[in-house]
Interface confidence: low
């Protein structure tokens, strides 16, 4: 058993046949010594008396809010949550496996630049009685600070018969060094509580591996005289690290016909312009990637040829 | 060529070669993004590689003030990786394919280190840890880890030379 936060405790249970469970001793936070009784949740049934209560926690029915009282007055609360290890594996029931980039990926994170700021998100099908708290650090043995905000519901989607809820959180490394080569990964820890079930999820990554620039901005076409060619120009996204002579991007320019089946013409360039042939009804798209490290491409920025 | 003690390197040449190094490092191990090698236990494997750290002066401001600190650090790393790529880890079984980019990568690391430090000048170099994996699968894992780490190192070096070529070239 360990304390998650004030008056909230997590009991780690081997979810096993005939498992004896965990013996837990609760102590009433009061100077009083006698006349103390204990109840669980909304029930008025007295579970025991005295300053301490010893319980055997085996099932969810044994978890919940234990309250000690004296003469009708509430003295203190202890909320017991269960963390299940089932068949040798900690339960991961609350979050959905996103399966990208590999199985058992519950948290996904992205950064728009090297400033030490990143966003993580996760999915669940649970709509109520759900809380999350997020902690992060750089390295684990001698952790350096990363500050995370509160997790918020960022999207709702309908998937078949189910509703899916996306939560996200923004974090910022306290003393980021954008130009350095990371040697210790960022660790992100999410505590999830659904009703009386506790679970924790972790992710470990280098910022360089989760970089995904915003799409290029101000994408413009300039027709070239007496030619089917156009000059496409664009700018670095505002959110990308500066100076651009140091934090450089490379770009992919694509000409795509109306039909998905039509052959795509692609040009790769380090410049912020390119000359391409603009076909009727086609569109021109440009995306960006770190020039020196193959992390994710940005989403496409597009303009129609016409 | 760089002459330790203050004169500038051939920024543009260094820029071109370091960008080539980036391309080669990724072609030598392209699927690296799909493997979480940190799960495989890092023990002594790549902990001892020289990293370009915050105080090494490789940021734009540090390069403007005095690029020598940073160039020395990059040189140290290049020599370190050049030795690793020429070691038993890469030359032993399972042998690399004949067209593997590792050979080119090895030669380019040497080329860039020589651009930074002509013969006759000596910056202090870092000792290579003695990594002699006994099993072929351990060697394979070590190669992945070294290439992974090299990708991060040469990315920073390429940024340094690109910025130097754009802003510090005479």
């Amino acid at each position: 058993i360990w304390e998650l936060k004030k008056d909230v405790y997590v009991v780690e249970l081997d979810w096993y046949p005939d498992a004896p469970g965990e013996m837990v001793v609760l102590t009433c936070d009061t100077p009083e010594e006698d006349g103390i009784t204990w109840t669980l949740d909304q029930s008025s049934e007295v579970l025991g008396s005295g300053k301490t209560l010893t319980i055997q926690v085996k099932e969810f029915g044994d978890a919940g809010q234990y309250t000690c009282h004296k003469g009708g007055e509430v003295l203190s609360h202890s909320l017991l949550l269960l963390h299940k290890k089932e068949d040798g594996i900690w339960s991961t029931d609350i979050l959905k496996d996103q399966k990208e980039p590999k199985n058992k990926t519950f948290l996904r994170c992205e950064a728009k630049n090297y400033s030490g700021r990143f966003t993580c998100w996760w999915l669940t099908t649970i709509s109520t009685d759900l809380t999350f708290s997020v902690k992060s650090s750089r390295g684990s043995s001698d952790p350096q600070g990363v500050t995370c905000g509160a997790a918020t519901l960022s999207a709702e989607r309908v998937r078949g018969d189910n509703k899916e809820y996306e939560y996200s959180v923004e974090c910022q490394e306290d003393s980021a060094c954008p130009a350095a080569e990371e040697s210790l990964p960022i660790e992100v820890m999410v505590d999830a509580v659904h009703k009386l079930k506790y679970e924790n999820y972790t992710s470990s990554f280098f910022i360089r591996d989760i970089i995904k620039p915003d799409p290029p901005k101000n994408l413009q076409l300039k027709p070239l005289k007496n030619s089917r060619q156009v000059e496409v120009s664009w700018e670095y996204p505002d959110t990308w690290s500066t100076p651009h002579s140091y934090f450089s991007l490379t770009f992919c320019v694509q000409v795509q016909g109306k039909s998905k089946r039509e052959k795509k013409d692609r040009v790769f360039t380090d410049k912020t312009s390119a000359t391409v042939i603009c076909r009727k009804n086609a569109s021109i798209s440009v995306r960006a990637q770190d020039r020196y490290y193959s992390s994710s491409w940005s989403e496409w920025a597009s303009v129609p040829c016409s | 060529r760089a002459v330790p003690g203050g004169s500038s390197p051939a920024w543009t040449q260094c820029q071109q070669l370091s960008q080539k190094l980036c391309t080669l490092a990724w072609s030598a191990h392209p699927l690296v993004g799909h493997m979480d090698l940190r799960e495989e236990g890092d023990e002594e494997t790549t902990n001892d590689v020289p990293h370009i750290q915050c105080g090494d002066g490789c940021d734009p401001q540090g390069l403007r003030d005095n690029s020598q600190f940073c160039l020395q650090r990059i040189h140290q790393g290049l020599i370190f990786y050049e030795k690793l790529l020429g070691s038993d880890i890469f030359t032993g079984e399972p042998s690399l394919l004949p067209d593997s980019p590792v050979g080119q990568l090895h030669a380019s690391l040497l080329g860039l280190s020589q651009l930074l430090q002509p013969e006759g000048h000596h910056w202090e170099t870092q000792q290579i840890p003695s990594l002699s994996p006994s099993q072929p699968w351990q060697r394979l894992l070590l190669r992945f880890k070294i290439l992974r780490s090299l990708q991060a190192f040469v990315a920073v070096a390429a940024r340094v030379f690109a910025h130097g070529a754009a802003t510090l070239s005479p």
């Epitope: 979810w15 096993y16 040798g88 594996i89 991961t92 029931d93 | -």
Partner: antibody
Amino acid sequence: EFQLVQSGAEVKKPGASVKVSCKASGYSFTDHNMNWVRQAPGQRLEWMGVINPNYGTTTYNQKFKGRVTITVDQSASTAYMELSSLRSEDTAVYYCARRGFAYWGQGTLVTVSS
Amino acid sequence: DIVMTQTPLSLPVTPGEPASISCRSSKSLLYKDGKTYLNWFLQKPGQSPQLLIYLMQTRASGVPDRFSGSGSGTDLTLKISRVEAEDVGVYYCQQIAEYPFTFGSGTKLEIK
């Protein structure tokens, strides 16, 4: 008293599907994972997958690559295992087993034959 | 997948004599929490398997104390101190340290 009661024997043709049920009683159905295990004649036991009845989350043995689907009906305290694209090697006794494998159903014989 | 190798395949025993079944795992079943995630089952003819031992050495309820489990993370043993006629059947080891859970090939215990 804890009990897991499975549906009766089935005979199927190759290429068909079979759905075996497992009704639980005597305990809180949603509190315990349900595993499915099969045993071909004279062979070792083979774990097929597991479901958490509370959330419907599943983990499958990749050997059955998309052929197995485990579901539950919470209101009926029943777990189901469906195996599709049957072949003769799928002839086996299929068992459901509660978390920790302390309680097993009586088994359902599925025969695949043309 | 973790491979469980069980020996012997067949074990003829005289009632009252001890018996020992071995199970070797291709990967350690010992977790950081100090527990070894291994089960032993007995399957009597025409019956479902019954759990004898879990967490390598803990007897399931109702299992006689003549059955005991021991071992390291990879080499596991089931011992019966004095075999009785009712102990005949096929004994299986099973790892539940990681998915997919896997079983040994079984050891058939028969009375001499």
